[in-house]
């Protein structure tokens, strides 16, 4: 058993049918010695008396808010949560496996640049009695500071019969140098509590591996005289790290017909312009990627050919 | 992928071109190592990230873009003295800071070159003959060093008398390649920046 926060405790249980559970001793936070009784949650049934209460915690019915009283007055509370260990592996009931980029990915994180700011998000089908708390650091043995905000509900989607809820959090490394070569990964730890169930999820990454630039901005077409060709031009996204000559991007320009089946013409360039043939009803899209470290491509920025 | 490159300053161009070749070569070598050594811990998540140049060179600091010198987190000032007669820069552009930066890059390349050559000698003794260093990568390191043209003492190739532990050698190869790829990215960024300024 360990303390999650003041008066909230997590009991770790080896979870299998007929498991013996864990013996837990609760102590009433009071100078009083006599006339103390204990109850669980809203029940008025007295579970025991005395300054300490010994209980055998086996399943969720044994978890909850234990309260010690004296003469009708509440003295203190202890909330017991359960953390299930199923065959040597901590349970992951609360969050959905996003399966990207690989199985057992519960937390996904992205950064728009090298400033040390990043966003993480996760999915759940649970809509109520759910709380999250996020901590982060650079490295784990001698951790350096990363400050995270509060997790917020960022999207709701309907998936088949189920509603899916997306939560996200923004974090910022306290003293980040965009040009630094990372040797210690960022660690992100999310505590999730659903009713009386506690779970924790972690992700470890280097900022360089989670970079996904914003799409190029100011995408424009300039028709070339007496030609079906157009000059496409764009600019680096505002959110990208500067100077751009150091943090260079490479670009992919795509001409896509109306039908998805039509052949796509693609050109790769390091410049912020390209000359392409504009077909009727086609659209021109441009996306960006770090020129030197191949992390994710940005989403496409698009303009119609007409 | 073949990407068109903007026409560079003629004085800077050789280094920019060679640094791009270097990044391509080390990335290919790392990919090959990860595939060949699939049963070894060779992915970024599994290895310890060690920098063999730590406390010996200070490339990131010495090559910091002017725009980032205002960022206090970037000024991890390590005093290191370097030889200052680089030939990559047209003389009108040579400044103390640039020379310091290029000299630091040269020292990095020299240290990695020695490590890789020592390691290759060990890998050639492996009866499994599982993996060797790409000669192209070693050649590209050499070409960039020549383009930088710094005079410095030759570092003797380390020779080891004890029987090599091939498992450890292959894991060290992965560690070295990951670190060298990251340094090659920095070198490419620096060359691109210097070329543009």
């Amino acid at each position: 058993i360990w303390e999650l926060k003041k008066d909230v405790y997590v009991v770790e249980l080896d979870w299998y049918p007929d498991a013996p559970g864990e013996m837990v001793v609760l102590t009433c936070d009071t100078p009083e010695e006599d006339g103390i009784t204990w109850t669980l949650d809203q029940s008025s049934e007295v579970l025991g008396s005395g300054k300490t209460l010994t209980i055998q915690v086996k399943e969720f019915g044994d978890a909850g808010q234990y309260t010690c009283h004296k003469g009708g007055e509440v003295l203190s509370h202890s909330l017991l949560l359960l953390h299930k260990k199923e065959d040597g592996i901590w349970s992951t009931d609360i969050l959905k496996d996003q399966k990207e980029p690989k199985n057992k990915t519960f937390l996904r994180c992205e950064a728009k640049n090298y400033s040390g700011r990043f966003t993480c998000w996760w999915l759940t089908t649970i809509s109520t009695d759910l709380t999250f708390s996020v901590k982060s650091s650079r490295g784990s043995s001698d951790p350096q500071g990363v400050t995270c905000g509060a997790a917020t509900l960022s999207a709701e989607r309907v998936r088949g019969d189920n509603k899916e809820y997306e939560y996200s959090v923004e974090c910022q490394e306290d003293s980040a140098c965009p040009a630094a070569e990372e040797s210690l990964p960022i660690e992100v730890m999310v505590d999730a509590v659903h009713k009386l169930k506690y779970e924790n999820y972690t992700s470890s990454f280097f900022i360089r591996d989670i970079i996904k630039p914003d799409p190029p901005k100011n995408l424009q077409l300039k028709p070339l005289k007496n030609s079906r060709q157009v000059e496409v031009s764009w600019e680096y996204p505002d959110t990208w790290s500067t100077p751009h000559s150091y943090f260079s991007l490479t670009f992919c320009v795509q001409v896509q017909g109306k039908s998805k089946r039509e052949k796509k013409d693609r050109v790769f360039t390091d410049k912020t312009s390209a000359t392409v043939i504009c077909r009727k009803n086609a659209s021109i899209s441009v996306r960006a990627q770090d020129r030197y470290y191949s992390s994710s491509w940005s989403e496409w920025a698009s303009v119609p050919c007409s | 992928r073949n990407l068109p490159v903007a026409t560079p300053d003629p004085g800077m161009f050789p280094c920019l071109h060679h640094s791009q070749n270097l990044l391509r070569a080390v990335s290919n070598m790392l990919q090959k190592a990860r595939q060949t050594l699939e049963f070894y811990p060779c992915t970024s998540e599994e290895i310890d990230h060690e920098d063999i140049t730590k406390d010996k060179t200070s490339t990131v600091e010495a090559c910091l873009p002017l725009e980032l010198t205002k960022n206090e987190s970037c000024l991890n000032s390590r005093e290191t003295s370097f030889i200052t007669n680089g030939s990559c820069l047209a003389s009108r552009k040579t400044s103390f800071m640039m020379a310091l930066c290029l000299s630091s890059i040269y020292e990095d390349l020299k240290m990695y070159q020695v490590e890789f050559k020592t390691m290759n000698a060990k890998l050639l003794m492996d009866p499994k003959r599982q993996i060797f260093l790409d000669q192209n990568m070693l050649a590209v390191i050499d070409e960039l060093m020549q383009a930088l043209n710094f005079n410095s003492e030759t570092v003797p190739q380390k020779s080891s008398l004890e029987e090599p532990d091939f498992y450890k050698t292959k894991i060290k190869l992965c560690i070295l390649l990951h670190a060298f790829r990251i340094r090659a990215v920095t070198i490419d960024r620096v060359m691109s920046y210097l070329n543009a300024s």
Epitope: W15, Y16, P17, D18, F60, E86, D87, I89, K102, K104 | -
Partner: antibody, heavy 115, light 112 residues
Framework: QVQLVQSGGGVVQPGRSLRLSCAAS????????MHWVRQAPGKGLEWVAF????????YYADSVKGRFTISRDNSKNTLYLQMKSLRAEDTAVYYC????????WGQGTMVTVSS | SYVLTQPPSVSGTPGQRVTISCSGG????????VKWYQQLPGTAPKLLIY???QRPSGVPDRFSGSKSGTSASLAITGVQAEDEADYYC????????????FGTGTKVTVLG
Amino acid sequence: QVQLVQSGGGVVQPGRSLRLSCAASGFTFSSYGMHWVRQAPGKGLEWVAFIRYDGSNKYYADSVKGRFTISRDNSKNTLYLQMKSLRAEDTAVYYCKTHGSHDNWGQGTMVTVSS
Amino acid sequence: SYVLTQPPSVSGTPGQRVTISCSGGRSNIGTNTVKWYQQLPGTAPKLLIYGNDQRPSGVPDRFSGSKSGTSASLAITGVQAEDEADYYCQSYDRGTHPALLFGTGTKVTVLG
């Protein structure tokens, strides 16, 4: 004590269907994940499928994906395996099993797929 | 498509020490715990070892398990006639959990 009693096995022709049941007693069935495991005659153990305690997630071996469906009825304390498009290679003893460090197995039920 | 490899058979005379190996990889035994089962002919498997080296109550102490890196082993010290059975190791793969990964199985024969 914990008990898992299996039923539903038998002889079936290729391409036909069969449903296996596993009745649980002696524990809070709705709190635990459950597996199906099979063993072809003279062969080793092969995992077939898993279902979470609340039925929210199901996982299958590639060899049965799209043909077998694992389900549970927590009000009846029963686990099921619906098997469709059966093949000769599905011939095996099928076991249900609880998930956890200490597990309990059903007695097994024989499924024979033969024309 | 077994990922955990066991020797097909091992044998020993009563009182001898018999060991069975179970070889896996970094993503299974390397990161997860190992169980061992005993299966007597015509019966369901019986748990012998969980958590690499833990014995459930009721399992004789002549059975012991261990794990090192990407391999595990089961030792029977002082093997007895009633130990003649098939033995399976089991673990999980970090990418496919909760799918159970079973070893190929080992037939233990007690001679004499």
